[in-house]
């Protein structure tokens, strides 16, 4: 019994290696490779319903090399675990589990979410956005001028997209009424809307002042009163008493 | 047939270095890998470590502070030293061989050798 | 360090009966498993590695199977020298361990 054996385990030796196969240090023909030459690693291949032994120059998914003085080996990952780096820590995770700290998990812990991009846990992501930029022009039906009512927009942007987690984000537009001093409009702008289309020639007193930006058109609520003459005067205070209305829209 | 003999001192004083050898015929050291067992009376057994082909060792950390395997080819010879011995060394150490993770595992086995720790 | 528990620790049984033995590790060993018989005052003897290969002059009636943590050894009909105490080793990462063996006495 133990002769047979050893006869059999004399042709493993290294030194008596003919017949094995590339990386083989010793083989036997039922098991295919027994050890590996250094630096390669061991692994059991299955073949049919048989495992052989074959030794490889890196591990397959699901498998990391261990090295121990004089002998390799592909060990495998945890269950959970497609890739890893050892058996400890996972750098990829099966299906259906999120990776967090080399961990494997069903569901990612407090203060973190899913990623089921990347299946990570990933920290929540809130929504960041810009300071407001300046009130539009004040404008009706897209013009500045023949008109005293109309809207002004401002407008801001998103910094950072929130993830599914994360808070929404604010409104990034708002409108609100808008009122300023009634004013023809100049020649580039007639003719535009309505009755004004068929006019050719400008009128006597139309104001050849260039639209105002919109940093007067914000202060347009409170124009000094040595900007305007008397008869305009009038007409503000009238303006004055109907306070200004703001709309958001939200993204 | 491979053939693994183990001997050294059946009785070692607490505190001193346990010392034992494995005589190995019928194979040669520089191939496969050698291995020092032990088994406490009535108990189970427990992995110490080996020496390989080339002479590179592994040891359990469980021992690794007090563990020494070393080996002498020109007489086919590896040893053991197990430092600071205590009663809870008190064994039976086999010495045994394995070719590769492809092939059985402890395929020759010594005879064993019982070490009691006393004073 | 990888543990292996095996069970049960001791068993009765007569000639002719089949006895299960088994072992579980405390994580996936993916075959990499041996199971030795040990008869008092003697080495133990390897009986079968890599979970169900038989070493060679080794009975048939002696069997392994299982995979990930989960292994069996199976006598199909236990003769009166398969009476001795039965250890199943892991192999698959260092320090290798052993289970806490299983003692097969006469019924």
């Known amino acids: 019994q133990n002769a047979s054996r050893g006869r059999r385990q004399r042709r493993m030796h290294p030194n008596v290696s003919q017949g094995c196969q590339g990386g083989c240090a010793t083989c036997s023909d039922y098991n295919g490779c027994l050890s590996c030459k250094p630096r390669l690693f061991f692994a059991l291949e299955r073949i049919g319903m048989k495992q052989i032994g074959v030794c490889l120059s890196s591990c397959p998914s699901g498998y990391y090399g261990t090295r121990y003085p004089d002998i390799n080996k592909c060990t495998k990952c945890k269950a959970d675990c497609d890739t890893c780096f050892n058996k400890n820590f996972c750098t990829k995770c099966k299906s259906g589990f999120y990776l967090h700290l080399g961990k494997c998990l069903d569901n990612c812990p407090e203060g973190l979410e899913a990623n089921n991009h990347t299946m990570e846990c990933v920290s929540i992501v809130h929504c960041e956005v810009s300071e407001w930029n300046p009130w539009s022009p004040c404008t009706k039906k897209g013009k500045t001028c023949g008109f005293k009512r109309g809207t002004e927009t401002r407008v801001r942007e998103i910094i950072q997209h929130p993830s599914a987690k994360g808070n929404l984000c604010p409104p990034t537009n708002e409108t609100r009424k808008c009122t300023v001093q009634r004013k023809k409009c100049q020649k580039g702008e007639r003719g535009k809307k309505g009755r004004e289309r068929k006019r050719k020639k400008p009128n006597k007193g139309e104001s050849k002042e260039a639209i105002p930006d919109s940093k007067s058109l914000e202060s347009s609520k409170e124009i000094p009163e040595q900007r305007e003459n008397k008869q305009q005067q009038k007409k503000r205070k009238v303006q004055d008493k109907q306070k200004s209305v703001s709309v958001s829209t939200v993204h | 047939e491979v053939q693994l003999v183990e001997s050294g001192p059946g009785l070692v004083k607490p505190s001193e270095t346990l010392s034992l050898t494995c005589t190995v015929s019928?194979?040669?050291?520089?191939?496969?890998?050698w291995n020092w067992i032990r088994q406490p009376p009535g108990k189970g057994l427990e992995y110490m470590g080996y020496?390989?082909?080339?002479?590179?060792?592994y040891q359990n950390p469980s021992l690794k502070s007090r563990i020494t395997i070393s080996r002498d080819t020109s007489k086919n010879q590896y040893s053991l030293k197990l430092s600071s011995v205590t009663a809870a060394d008190t064994a039976v150490y086999y010495c045994?061989?394995?070719?590769?993770?492809?092939?059985?595992?402890?395929?020759?086995w010594g005879q064993g050798t019982l070490v009691t720790v006393s004073s | 360090d990888i543990q292996m528990t095996q069970s049960p620790s001791s068993l009765s049984a007569s000639v002719g009966d089949r006895v299960t033995i088994t072992c579980k590790a405390s994580?996936?060993?993916?075959?990499?498993l041996s199971w030795f018989q040990q008869k008092p005052g003697k080495a133990p003897k390897t009986l079968i590695y890599l979970t169900n290969r038989l070493v060679d002059g080794v009975p048939s009636r002696f069997s392994g199977s299982g995979s990930g943590q989960d292994y069996t050894l199976t006598i199909s009909s236990l003769q009166p020298e398969d009476f001795a105490t039965y250890y199943c080793?892991?192999?698959?990462?260092?320090?290798?361990?052993f289970g806490q063996g299983t003692k097969v006495e006469i019924k």
């Open positions: 045994a061989t394995y070719y590769g993770y492809g092939g059985p595992w402890f395929a020759y």
């Open positions: 994580q996936d060993i993916d075959s990499y």
């Open positions: 020496i390989s082909y080339s002479g590179k060792t």
């Open positions: 019928g194979d040669s050291i520089t191939s496969g890998y």
């Open positions: 080793l892991h192999y698959d990462e260092f320090p290798l361990t």
